[in-house]
Amino acid sequence: TFFQKPESCPPVPGGSMKLDIGIINENQRVSMSRNIESRSTSPWDYTVTWDPNRYPSEVVQAQCRNLGCINAQGKEDISMNSVPIQQETLVVRRKHQGCSVSFQLEKVLVTVGCTCVTPVIHHVQ
Amino acid sequence: TFFQKPESCPPVPGGSMKLDIGIINENQRVSMSRNIESRSTSPWDYTVTWDPNRYPSEVVQAQCRNLGCINAQGKEDISMNSVPIQQETLVVRRKHQGCSVSFQLEKVLVTVGCTCVTPVIHHVQ
């Protein structure tokens, strides 16, 4: 797998690897159009979760506001569906016992925003 | 910072830390078998980038198909805007020289999908 050494090399001691300090592109920032969460036809709110033993400590989850989508009159149109757009992301967990600190990667499912879709006829019609 | 040991502890040798093997929730998956990218009123396409020295090796970027949004008649309505939804995510870079393998975190900006918004009137007045 990705984290294993080549077969011809001695195995990693204690099931851990070397993680270099410093993050490439650490200061890179999202520059989204402003207030898209409230201007969208499938608007959303944000919920922030905070964990001091996770990097990044702050993870933001979007929550669609409506079942349907907002039409030109500003009313909810239930013939269309607001749906979440999700993304798998990696975070780093910090585990410490005294001065012994180790880190582990964790996969987190983040809802980034919402989009308006034409419905597929499921059970809800 | 997050990756530093407490001040009372001896510094990390060689500017690296211990990364435990294995990923928490590794098998967690986005349930995107829903074709929302083509059913959206702000549809998008995907481009896949592949890098064997990155985890995950595959990073998917979305590109909005239209400037405007698709109306009920399936036509582009230029009075509304399709805009990208972006998310910062972490990936892991693998660096190796012979049997010496180390890893480093990297921030990557991913466009996850698109949403349809009411335009903000800017410079066009």
Partner: nanobody
């Protein structure tokens, strides 16, 4: 793991009313909609109603429109189903569940259901 506890079912005469409650715990930060579903003997489970946690907007299946009203208490993470003018064909076990994709959620995506609450309408 989402935990769901439904209550409020019972035996009622046609034309009567019941109020079902559902307590949900373990919801993710992105959970935005809840639904009521029902399963009559020998039939498949079907959608009854849905509500948005934030806006309170609702959607109903045609057969219960104007008779059932779904509401929610966002702070308590509870949803309710007010059932009026009940008919014998409303007899079923009623379940609530998170709708992670709102109205786009498919029945086959559900892994976990609560125990449900039995509603029996006699004629």
């Amino acid at each position: 793991q989402v935990q769901l506890v439904e209550s409020g079912g019972g035996l009622v005469q046609a034309g009567g009313s019941l109020r079902l409650s559902c307590a949900a715990s373990g919801l993710t930060g992105s959970s935005y909609a809840m639904g009521w579903f029902r399963q009559a003997p020998g039939k498949e489970r079907e959608f009854v109603a849905a509500i948005s946690w934030i806006s309170g907007g609702t959607k109903y299946t045609d057969s219960v429109k104007d008779r059932f009203t779904m509401s929610r208490d966002y702070a308590k993470k509870q949803v309710y189903l007010e059932m009026n003018s009940l008919k014998p064909e409303d007899t079923a076990v009623y379940y609530c569940n998170d709708m992670p994709y709102g109205l786009d959620t498919r029945m086959d995506e559900y892994v976990y259901w609560g125990q449900g609450t039995q509603v029996t309408v006699s004629s």
